[in-house]
């Protein structure tokens, strides 16, 4: 194998791998025909002048996970065929100017997970064929203008997990071929207008986990090919009305963990490929008409953990494909009867941890495919007659932690619940809050005549699906359920329809049952 160092393994196809803590310098002699060299997990601390001089055919060089902290400017001399160079996971703080000079074929340069403090235009000025540059996980505080000006063929640039506080609007201006730009986990507070204007081929932009407060109105207007836009966990307080108008290819958009207070109608411009929109952990207080009307293919809308107290009746217009709507942990007190009318394909709605006092009888009128409804931990005292009657696919209904008023008016609901107990789950059942003498007792088994002995309970029709089931033997037997089979058979049809089984979020938030419902 043309002389393989003892501490390395060499294959007859010119592959050399040198690993182990006993290696403290680049092993020699390296086989002259080596095309791939990997130096991994060693105790090498520096690269001196031209350690690879005799292996000019080298195509790939990986020097990773070492103690490397110093490199001589001529370390990579004579490696004109090198296409891939990784110096990731070392302890580099400084890159000497001219280090990459002569690497005319270099396409991938990985400098991630080091301790680099700065980069300069001269560092990459010779790397005109570079397609991928990984700089994430360093200590960069700023990028000087011109740093990437010669990298016109660059398609992927990762600057994530650094300490960048600002970005010059000119720093990316020559990167017309860039497809992926990652700036996540920095300290950016704003992005100047025009910063991304030259990135006409950009498909992924990762800006999550910064401190961005404002987005310029036209920030993404030249990025028509953008498909993934990550903006979560910033300090964004408002979205300019046109900021997302020119993003027809977008299929992933994250905005959770910001400070958004309001959303203007049509803010989400036509995005026919967007399936999920996560807006949880913001400060949204109301939803106006048509705010999501352009999102025709949206299937999941997460609006939980906001401060929503008002939803306009037409807020969800256009969401004909929506299957899951999460509104839990907000400040809702009332809902318009037509608010969900357009959501014909809705299967799961989360309304727990709000302040709902009542629900309109037609609230679920057009949402016939509902499988799961979360209503726990609200202020509900009763529910309208027949509210769930048409929901033949309903297999999960959570009603606990509400102040149910167990007077005679509760009978229709109680009877329906009695027949549909499996839908309520086994963890927690709804209990009476009033009158005081039945407080804490299960709503399902409570004897209403005990609760309110002075009130005569008239024989009224109940939820049409189920017969009225009185407590006292003075009522005719014909109104009682004839057999347990009749009681359970409709329910058995639903127990297998657990297409969506929403997990209880209490564990995620570390809340007790009393806190969260």
């Amino acid at each position: 194998y043309h002389g393989c160092p003892s501490e390395c393994t060499c294959s007859r196809a010119s592959q050399v791998e040198c690993t182990g803590a006993r290696i403290v310098a680049v092993p020699t002699p390296l086989p002259w025909n080596a095309m791939s060299l990997q130096i991994l997990n060693t105790h090498i601390t520096e690269l001196n002048e031209s350690p690879f001089l005799n292996i000019s055919a080298l195509i790939a060089l990986r020097i990773e996970k070492n103690e490397l902290s110093r490199i001589t400017p001529g370390a990579f001399r004579n490696l004109g065929s090198l296409r891939y160079l990784s110096l990731a996971n070392n302890k580099l703080q400084v890159l000497p100017i001219g280090l990459f000079q002569g690497l005319d074929s270099l396409e991938s340069l990985l400098l991630s997970s080091n301790q680099l403090l700065q980069i300069q235009p001269a560092h990459f000025s010779q790397c005109s064929n570079l397609k991928e540059l990984q700089l994430h996980g360093n200590h960069l505080e700023y990028i000087p203008d011109g740093a990437f000006d010669h990298l016109v063929g660059l398609t992927k640039l990762n600057l994530g997990k650094n300490s960048l506080t600002h970005i010059s609007p000119r720093v990316f201006q020559h990167l017309g071929n860039l497809q992926v730009l990652r700036l996540y986990e920095n300290r950016l507070t704003d992005i100047p207008m025009g910063t991304f204007d030259g990135l006409v081929n950009l498909q992924e932009l990762a800006l999550q986990q910064n401190q961005i407060g404002l987005l310029s109105p036209g920030l993404f207007h030249n990025n028509h090919n953008l498909q993934r836009l990550y903006l979560s966990n910033n300090h964004i307080s408002q979205l300019p009305p046109s900021v997302f108008m020119q993003l027809p290819q977008l299929n992933r958009l994250t905005l959770f963990g910001n400070s958004l207070k309001e959303l203007s109608p049509g803010i989400f411009g036509p995005m026919p490929n967007l399936r999920e929109l996560w807006l949880y952990d913001n400060h949204i207080s109301s939803l106006p008409d048509n705010v999501f009307s352009n999102l025709r293919q949206l299937q999941v809308l997460i609006l939980s953990r906001n401060q929503i107290s008002f939803i306009s009746p037409g807020a969800f217009n256009g969401l004909t494909e929506l299957r899951e709507l999460s509104l839990h942990t907000n400040a809702l007190q009332d809902l318009d009867g037509n608010v969900f009318r357009m959501l014909a394909n809705l299967q799961n709605i989360s309304l727990q941890n709000n302040r709902l006092r009542q629900l309109p009888g037609n609230i679920f009128a057009n949402v016939n495919g509902l499988m799961a409804i979360q209503l726990q931990n609200n202020q509900l005292e009763n529910l309208p007659l027949g509210i769930f009657d048409h929901l033949g696919k309903l297999c999960e209904l959570r009603l606990y932690d509400n102040p149910w008023r167990c007077d005679s008016d509760i009978l229709p609901l109680r009877n329906w619940l009695l027949l549909n107990q499996p839908r309520l789950g086994t963890d927690t059942v709804p209990v009476c809050f009033s009158p005081a003498n039945v407080r804490g007792q299960s709503l399902i088994i409570i004897n209403v005549n005990v609760a309110v002995p002075s009130v005569h309970v008239p024989e009224v029709p109940s939820y049409p699906e189920t017969p009225w089931y009185p407590d006292t033997p003075s009522y005719p037997d014909t109104t009682s359920v004839s057999s347990t089979t009749e009681l359970t058979s409709p329910v058995e049809d639903y127990t297998d329809l657990t297409t969506i089984q929403v997990t209880d979020d209490r564990s995620v938030w570390g809340m007790t049952q009393a806190q969260s419902g």
């Epitope: 398609t155 497809q179 081929n201 498909q203 994250t254 299937q299 999941v300 969506i500 997990t503």
Partner: antibody, heavy 122, light 107 residues
Framework: QVQLVESGGDLVTPGGSLRLSCAAS????????MTWIRQAPGKGLEWISD????????DYADSVKGRFTISRDNAKNSLYLQMSSLRAEDTAVYYC???????????????WGQGTMVTVSS | EIVLTQSPSSLSASVGDRVTIKCRAS??????LAWYQQKPGKAPKLLIY???SLESGVPSGFSGSGSGTDFTLTISSLQPEDFATYYC?????????FGPGTKVDIK
């Protein structure tokens, strides 16, 4: 350890129905997208469907749209594929896989089951 | 839908050889591409994600490169356990299509 186990594969006649199950263990099932992929005998891999972590979002390949339904039960750590109007060309090994993705560029089916054979023949 | 083509469809190589497999997308998919290895009778195994990132536990002899429409999987030194079929897959948009596969067998 992290594991996916498919079941439910069988011999079925054209036009028939079948329900495949995939039992997950060793990871927090409700945190992950899940997917079904199939492989006809001697052929390549074909993505057929995936489902979001909560079950809200779903997508299908055109070849199965309207005939197959993907679903999940997070309480039971289970993924399902309800197949109806089966055709001879649906004959394949069906794999379930965990679809792992994040906002730092990770995208991949990183955990696979062993597969279950579905044969559609008269 | 995005169509992935792989070349070659099959190749014969010896232990120690350097092997290169190409995957081309019908339209740009940035770096949303993964590579899998499948052995007969077994489920596929993820090797590379994000076009060039090595999945945890995968030997460092595997590497990926490329973005946009042209991608490459390289096995720096073929080992006996590397004889298998290799598939690329795109995650840029639905449906998440696979390439037709490249079979690597013993010369």
């Amino acid at each position: 350890q992290v594991q996916l186990v498919e079941s439910g594969g069988d011999l079925v006649t054209p036009g028939g129905s079948l329900r495949l199950s995939c039992a997950a263990s060793g990871f927090t099932f409700s945190d992950y997208y899940m997917t079904w992929i199939r492989q006809a005998p001697g052929k390549g891999l074909e993505w057929i469907s995936d489902i979001g972590s909560s079950g809200g979002s779903v997508d299908y390949a055109d070849s199965v749209k309207g005939r197959f339904t993907i679903s999940r039960d997070n309480a039971k750590n289970s993924l399902y594929l309800q197949m109806s109007s089966l055709r001879a060309e649906d004959t394949a090994v069906y794999y379930c896989a965990r679809y792992n993705w994040n906002d730092r560029g990770y995208d991949g089916f990183d955990i696979w089951g062993q597969g279950t054979m579905v044969t559609v023949s008269s | 839908e995005i169509v992935l083509t792989q070349s070659p469809s099959s190749l014969s190589a010896s232990v120690g050889d350097r092997v290169t497999i190409k995957c081309r997308a019908s339209q740009g998919i940035s770096s949303a591409l993964a590579w899998y290895q499948q052995k007969p009778g077994k489920a596929p195994k993820l090797l590379i994600y994000d076009a060039s990132s090595l999945e945890s536990g995968v030997p460092s002899g595997f590497s990926g490169s490329g973005s946009g429409t042209d991608f490459t999987l390289t096995i720096s030194s073929l080992q006996p356990e590397d004889f298998a079929t290799y598939y690329c897959q795109q995650f840029n948009s639905y449906p998440h299509t696979f390439g037709p596969g490249t079979k690597v067998d013993i010369k």
